[in-house]
Each structure stands twice: as structure tokens, then as C-alpha cells.
């Protein structure tokens, strides 16, 4: 069950996909991939009131366990639900090649 | 890529699986959930440093990013990486039913 | 209109060959670097095979080094992908896509084909 999309917190403030852009030096991947220099890595953050973007059973049950035990059990966290492939040419013993990673990118994100 | 099982931060200060007892009223089930009264909720609670547990490429990239950006990407968080069934006897309109949830108690933990 | 047509796909026996061609209409294919992806039934897209606008520079996934060949007409404002020596995992949708650098990425490339559909069994 993916609950509401509604944020009681504001616009933008609760879980959803944000772009941060990175370099090769930012990532540590300048020893190891040739292109693209630059990665526009989407990912998921903000905050996870109640019900918002619920994942499942488990993300339901974590907000109230929350609810009643703030020190003991977190909020539920902004994951992503799924991922975009990303290809980078990377180096390799005998040159160049083209590889594809599936869990790279976020493509959209929920609370969990 | 599941990487380091070594906590640096002390013993079960990292993500891993906890415990949590509940009662229908805590979950909010005493209206529809007949059996049982009490449930040990596993859930995946406790910090996330610098590769440990990470899930995939994408959990990499969020730790390279948060130690440059820690006001903007937050830490890798601790979430479910599989989950164990529970099965619950609920109320219905003509009874009682037996049902099975497969997204209710952590399994085992990662980071993402 | 702008768009991309994948063409040339077939059913073909392990060992043999197949061309693939990528069509451009309504823009210039040269300004831009073109890329090949392959998606197989239930798995992810996987990038096969890029050539750049710049120098024509090639790359490859390693499933396909030694075996596919990519090249470009300009003239025909075309982009090909020759198949030599396929193998039954080679079966898949094969697409292009344009976009201004390599590696062409997946999710954000400027535009992409509706795919041809490539079959290697006996």
C-alpha cells in the first residue's frame, strides 16, 4: 500500500526524488570510469511523517511503534522503490568498455 | 556489492535487526486483528557509516555524497532487505479470517 | 518529426548475423553520439554499444566485444550495429537513442526508437 502523496510538512519537504550533481572526484570513481565526467544522481530524500509514501505493512507499523517510542524506533527513511539503469564506460585491463548498472539512479522513492 | 559486517562505531551501534514488542493498541490493530494480541515486530534500527551493510551502487554513491553534502544527502539508512510472513486472524464481516503478510517483520538489514 | 526507426532484426540461428540500422529523421544524427540497448524479456535495459559525434569513437559492453560492430553514415543519416557470431542470449528488443555525448544513457536520452526485435535460436 503506497499511502498518501499529500506532505502535512510543506512542499518539498517530505520524501521524494532529488537530483545532486557529481563529478568522478566526487563519487571516488576517477580511477575507474572514463565518462560521463559528471553524473546527475538522483535520489531520494526528505522527511517520512506518518503514512507518507508508506511502503508497506512494515512502514505503517514503524510510524506508530515511532509514535510511541521516539528514542527507540526511528521514523520511517526515503528510499528509493525503484531504480534507473545507468551505463558508464569505464576503464578496463585491456581498454575500454560499456557497463550497465541497474541500481545506480533512484527512480522513485517511498518511506520505509 | 553487501559490504563490511564490522561496526566501527562500538557493538550493535550499526544497522542490524532489533526487536520490538507490541500490542494491538500500539498498532493500531485491536479493531480488526482478533490473534495474536502481542507481536514481536523485528525491525531494522542503528546507524549506517561509510560502507557498511551498503546494498547496492546507489548506497555508495549516497555515502560518498554525504561526506561532501551532509546538510544536503543524507547517511545511508538502515531498511529491511528481506522480510519474514506473519500471519494474522482478523475479523471479517462474516467472522474470522487467516491471513498472511509478506512486507510485515524485517528479515534481515541493509543499507540504502 | 523528430525520430529515431530501428530496422534489420530477425530470427537467426546461433553463430549467425544480423545489421541493425538506426534512422534518423527530422535532425542531424551526426551532432550527436548514438547509442544501442538491448532489453530482454523480464531483465533491465542493458547498454550494448555507443559511437560519439566527435571523433566516431566506439565502445562496448563486454557480453559483445569481438562480435557486434558499430558504424555510422552520414550520409544516410544512419547509425548500424553489424552482429556477427550471435548466441541465444543475444535475444532481446534492441532500441537506439541519441543523446550528445557517450555513454547515451537510458533514462534521459533526447529521443529513442520503438525497438527491433532480434531472435537467435535454432
Known amino acids: 500500500a503506497r499511502n498518501g502523496d499529500h506532505c502535512p510538512l510543506g512542499p518539498g519537504r517530505c520524501c521524494r526524488l532529488h537530483t545532486v550533481r557529481a563529478s568522478l572526484e566526487d563519487l571516488g570513481w576517477a580511477d575507474w570510469v572514463l565518462s560521463p565526467r559528471e553524473v546527475q544522481v538522483t535520489m531520494c530524500i526528505g522527511a517520512c511523517p506518518s503514512q507518507f509514501r508508506a511502503a508497506n505493512m512494515h512502514a505503517q507499523i514503524k510510524t506508530s511503534l515511532h509514535r510511541l517510542k521516539p528514542d527507540t524506533v526511528p521514523a520511517p527513511c526515503c528510499v528509493p522503490a525503484s531504480y534507473n539503469p545507468m551505463v558508464l564506460i569505464q576503464k578496463t585491463d585491456t581498454g575500454v568498455s560499456l557497463q550497465t548498472y541497474d541500481d545506480l539512479l533512484a527512480k522513485d522513492c517511498h518511506c520505509i | 556489492a553487501r559490504n563490511g559486517d564490522h561496526c566501527p562505531l562500538g557493538p550493535g551501534r550499526c544497522c542490524r535487526l532489533h526487536t520490538v514488542r507490541a500490542s494491538l493498541e500500539d498498532l493500531g490493530w485491536a479493531d480488526w486483528v482478533l490473534s495474536p494480541r502481542e507481536v514481536q515486530v523485528t525491525m531494522c534500527i542503528g546507524a549506517c557509516p561509510s560502507q557498511f551493510r551498503a546494498a547496492n551502487m546507489h548506497a555508495q554513491i549516497k555515502t560518498s555524497l554525504h561526506r561532501l553534502k551532509p546538510d544536503t544527502v543524507p547517511a545511508p539508512c538502515c531498511v529491511p532487505a528481506s522480510y519474514n510472513p506473519m500471519v494474522l486472524i482478523q475479523k471479517t464481516d462474516t467472522g474470522v479470517s487467516l491471513q498472511t503478510y509478506d512486507d510485515l517483520l524485517a528479515k534481515d538489514c541493509h543499507c540504502i | 518529426q523528430v525520430q529515431l526507426v530501428e530496422s534489420g532484426g530477425g530470427l537467426v540461428q546461433p553463430g549467425g548475423s544480423l545489421r541493425l540500422a538506426c534512422a534518423a529523421s527530422g535532425f542531424t544524427l551526426d551532432a550527436y553520439a548514438v547509442g544501442w540497448f538491448r532489453q530482454a524479456p523480464g531483465k533491465n535495459p542493458e547498454g550494448v554499444s555507443c559511437?560519439?559525434?566527435?571523433?566516431?569513437?566506439?565502445y562496448y559492453a563486454d557480453s559483445v566485444k569481438g562480435r557486434f560492430t558499430i558504424s555510422r553514415d552520414n550520409a544516410k543519416n544512419t547509425v548500424y550495429l553489424q552482429m556477427n557470431s550471435l548466441k541465444p542470449g543475444d535475444t532481446a528488443v534492441y532500441y537506439c537513442?541519441?543523446?550528445?555525448?557517450?555513454?547515451?544513457?537510458?533514462?534521459?536520452?533526447?529521443?529513442r526508437g520503438q525497438g527491433t526485435q532480434v531472435t537467435v535460436s535454432s
Open positions: 537513442a541519441a543523446d550528445l555525448s557517450c555513454p547515451v544513457q537510458i533514462a534521459t536520452f533526447h529521443s
Open positions: 559511437i560519439s559525434s566527435s571523433d566516431g569513437s566506439a
